[in-house]
């Protein structure tokens, strides 16, 4: 069964910068990836980026740069302008659509150990979740 992993990282040097990494584990070629925050797109979440393998990417603030890392994984850099660092408690969701198989979605957030008050940056560990 295909699975989606989501990993949220805070940049060690800039506490206001976050990166969301998402990947698709399974057969099929990806046609579209949608990244949202605050929940899944369509269920109260806000769309941050849409990535198409051929037609390119669209992104919305506070997304800074969305890109493909491999044919089945993407990364999205975010710039947190607020001093209170709201990203720390936010859920990020990635939905991978593959034709004709369908869509798979997972959500993740910054691990609790990644609190800005801590000196060492977190070790990136994929957050595996069953699709919603």
């Amino acid at each position: 069964t295909p699975e989606v992993w989501v990993q949220v990282q805070m940049e060690a040097t800039e506490l206001s910068s976050f990166t969301v990494h998402c990947g698709f584990l399974g057969p099929g070629s990806i046609s579209l990836v949608t990244v949202s925050w605050g929940g899944p797109d369509g269920a109260g979440g806000t769309k941050l980026a849409v990535l198409h393998p051929e037609l390119g990417t669209r992104q919305w603030a506070p997304a800074r740069q969305a890109r493909w890392e491999t044919q089945s994984s993407i990364s999205l850099a975010l710039e947190d302008s607020g001093a209170s660092s709201p990203f720390a408690n936010t859920t990020f969701c990635c939905k991978f659509a593959s034709f004709p198989e369908g869509s798979w979605e997972s959500c993740g957030s910054l691990p609790p150990s990644s609190d800005p008050g801590l000196s060492a940056p977190p070790t990136p560990v994929p957050i595996l979740r069953a699709d919603l």
Partner: antibody
């Protein structure tokens, strides 16, 4: 203007074969996923077969697996559905349709349909 | 496969009425739902995608809502040209499946 024009339907005997064609125009045919959808006499819609833009990944309705084959000829902008061992339940109006990635794979263009009647 | 149960099968309404069609999925399909309109003698036409997004040229009297398993399609003010059969469809998991259709008739 996007257009999809089906042909090849007709009256066929039980167990017979038929090849449907759909000529596409007005868009880059090779960049889109395509499918065949049928509408039964009861007006129910069923996705029969689909093919990814990469021409590798395909889908078939369980009841047509092993009997139907979807393919496309990029040079001729044509989608095909080869149907064999036809059954009475294959009687329907067959549409070809284009899927749009940005619309959640919804079918944004449909042909006018070609009728297939399987008789005993 | 995912079953899309659409109700009602028939609707007899007057021009100007507000009508609602519901579609219930047998499991969550998130927001991967489209709605189509099929006028007599014509092929189906896309009205809405991702539940609530209007396809090009579709009037805003057509409204889609829902998420997960329960979806509604509303025509806020029915017009004579809305005489048609309406279908919901899920594209969340293969095989894509359609609702049974709702035939809208105008008094």
């Amino acid at each position: 203007d996007v257009q999809l024009v089906e042909s090849g339907g007709g009256l066929v005997k039980l167990g017979g074969s038929l090849k449907l064609s759909c000529v596409a125009s007005g868009f880059t045919f090779s960049s889109y996923h395509m499918s065949w959808i049928r509408q039964t006499p009861e007006k129910r819609l069923e996705l029969v077969a689909a093919i990814n833009s990469n021409d590798i990944n395909t889908y078939y309705l369980d009841t047509v697996k092993g009997r139907f084959t979807i393919s496309r000829d990029i040079a001729k902008n044509t989608l095909h559905l080869q149907m064999s061992s036809l059954k009475s339940e294959d009687t329907a109006l067959y549409y070809c349709a284009r899927h749009e990635d940005y619309y959640g794979f919804a079918m944004d263009y449909w042909g006018q349909g070609t009728s297939v009647t399987v008789s005993s | 496969s995912i079953v899309m149960t659409q109700t009602p099968k028939f609707l007899l309404v007057s021009a100007g009425d507000r009508v609602t069609i519901t579609c219930k999925a047998s499991q969550s399909v998130t927001n991967d739902v489209a709605w189509y309109q099929q006028k007599p003698g014509q092929s189906p036409k896309l009205l809405m995608y991702y539940v609530s997004n209007h396809y090009t040229g579709v009037p805003d009297r057509f409204i889609g809502s829902g998420y997960g398993t329960d979806f509604t399609f509303t025509i806020s003010t029915v017009q004579a040209e809305d005489l048609a059969v309406y279908f919901c469809q899920q594209a969340y998991r293969s095989p894509w499946t359609f609702g049974g259709g709702t035939k809208l008739e105008i008094k």
